[in-house]
């Protein structure tokens, strides 16, 4: 005859343990049900009476199966910076991962606790390594031969255009400005020459660099914040 | 219902040493949550580590007892132990051992409360 | 983690006064999971009140629990010189990754 099947509550037989989704109350000496997600131990189990389980209330969770007095509290709402994916429900808490733009600081098990926003690159700085969800961008110095004329999360530092003759000898912060040795039209007086670029960038010409955009001092990388640039704002 | 707690000693620096809690009028091995706290001479409660006896098995242990405490139940000797390694002089306490009068629990984590009975305590001095 | 912080660190009163504990716990907690405890100089700690208000067995109604969220009190009143002890509070909550419990760090109370 197969072993009957015991109803909670029950006592243990010596040396054993409860089943799953039971647990042994201390007070009554037996096993008893654990409450499912969504629900909380409204009533503990005496030595006559089951569990009794309730919902959770509005802004708490439980997530797990659970013999607890009250159910756990939701974390508070998204800041302003963030974006909640997932809603605070009776079986799950809220969400708040980090609105584009910015990045997570300060991480939680599920979400992230504090977002800060994205470094930006300055003129003449370029993205080394672009950020991620839970890491900053990392900006490095424009290599000579290379520049970068924005602030930006997220432009690399391009190379300067190769020109027959420059008329503007490219920097850090700025491109190369071409001119053409034998124009096929004149120009009118204070006419702008436009650039001429040659077919490819793949060469180029050694700029000077200006000391004060494109420092020849080695950088380490991860290099600390750049200071921003002019104007520039968080966001 | 007692405990009584035993394997305190006076160790060197760098040394390990292993306490045990045994229990008379009830089984530790089965269903309690049973818990180790120490008391630095002239100082506080400090809660180290706890064991769920039952099916789950869950320990839990403060988050500066990590790495050099050991908790762990002995079946057939209705025992407690913990274990604790590179004792320093920070160590020298009483170490108690009692047990959870209540427990809660939320998925595989168990919460214990209201310790209720307590071992009167073995001293540990860590000094060269 | 979770921090009880206790205040006064120690209380002096006279036989027949009362006496007032505070335990502030860090983050806001169940008062099910909130214990006190009697400790006496050289002996193990005695448990006073569990679920923050209900009395152990053997322990006199002088004794009083109180409290919700962040705050609870230990309310000994009628002092008796027997009362003179260090107590404690213990407390603890649950989250998704863990179950966090200490213990506060101690009020110790002088009868006069």
């Known amino acids: 005859l197969p072993a009957q099947v015991a109803f909670t509550p029950y006592a243990p037989e010596p040396g054993s343990t409860c089943r799953l989704r039971e647990y042994y109350d201390q007070t009554a000496q037996m096993c008893c049900s654990k409450c499912s997600p969504g629900q909380h131990a409204k009533v503990f189990c005496t030595k006559t009476s089951d569990t009794v389980c309730d919902s959770c209330e509005d802004s708490t969770y439980t997530q797990l199966w659970n013999w607890v007095p009250e159910c756990l509290s939701c974390g508070s709402r998204c800041s302003s910076d963030q974006v909640e994916t997932q809603a605070c429900t009776r079986e799950q808490n809220r969400i708040c991962t980090c609105r584009p733009g910015w990045y997570c600081a300060l991480s939680k098990q599920e979400g992230c606790r504090l977002c800060a926003p994205l470094r930006k690159c300055r003129p003449g700085f370029g993205v080394a390594r672009p950020g991620t969800e839970t890491s900053d961008v990392v900006c490095k110095p424009c290599a000579p031969g290379t520049f970068s004329n924005t602030t930006s999360s997220t432009d690399i530092c391009r190379p300067h255009q190769i020109c027959n003759v420059v008329a503007i000898p490219g920097n850090a912060s700025m491109d190369a400005v071409c001119t053409s040795t034998s124009p096929t039209r004149s120009m009118a007086p204070g006419a702008v020459h436009l650039p001429q670029p040659v077919s490819t960038r793949s060469q180029h010409t050694q700029p000077t660099p200006e000391p004060s955009t494109a420092p020849s001092t080695s950088f380490l990388l991860p290099m600390g914040p750049s200071p921003p640039a002019e104007g520039s704002t968080g966001d | 219902q007692s405990l009584e707690e035993s394997g305190g000693d006076l160790v060197q620096p760098g040394a390990s040493l292993t306490l045990t809690c045994t229990a008379s009028g009830f089984s530790v091995n089965v269903n309690s949550y049973m818990c180790w706290v120490r008391q630095a001479p002239g100082k506080g409660l400090e809660l180290i580590a706890c064991i769920d006896t039952g099916s789950g098995g869950s320990t839990w242990y403060g988050s500066w007892a990590k790495g050099r405490f050991t908790i762990s139940k002995s079946t057939n000797l209705n025992t407690v132990t913990l274990q604790m390694t590179s004792l320093t002089a920070a160590d020298t306490a009483t170490y108690f051992c009692?047990?959870?009068?209540?427990?809660?629990?939320?998925?595989?984590?168990?919460?214990?409360?209201?310790?209720?009975?307590w071992g009167p305590g073995t001293l540990v001095t860590v000094s060269s | 983690d979770i921090v009880m912080t206790q205040t006064p660190a120690s209380v002096e009163a006279a036989v027949g006064g009362t006496v007032t504990i505070k335990c502030q716990a860090s983050?806001?907690?169940?008062?099910?999971?909130l214990s006190w405890y009697q400790q006496k100089p050289g002996q193990r700690p005695k448990l006073l009140i569990y679920q923050a208000s209900t009395l152990a067995s053997g322990v006199p109604s002088r004794f009083k629990g109180s409290g919700s969220g962040t705050e609870f009190t230990l309310t000994i009143s009628d002092l008796e010189c027997a009362d003179a002890a260090t107590y404690y509070c213990?407390?603890?909550?649950?989250?998704?990754?863990?179950?966090?419990?200490?213990f506060g760090g101690g009020t110790e109370v002088v009868v006069k």
């Open positions: 213990q407390g603890g909550y649950f989250s998704d990754n863990g179950c966090y419990n200490a």
């Open positions: 009692a047990r959870a009068r209540n427990t809660y629990g939320y998925g595989d984590y168990v919460y214990g409360g209201a310790f209720d009975p």
């Open positions: 983050q806001s907690i169940s008062s099910t999971y």
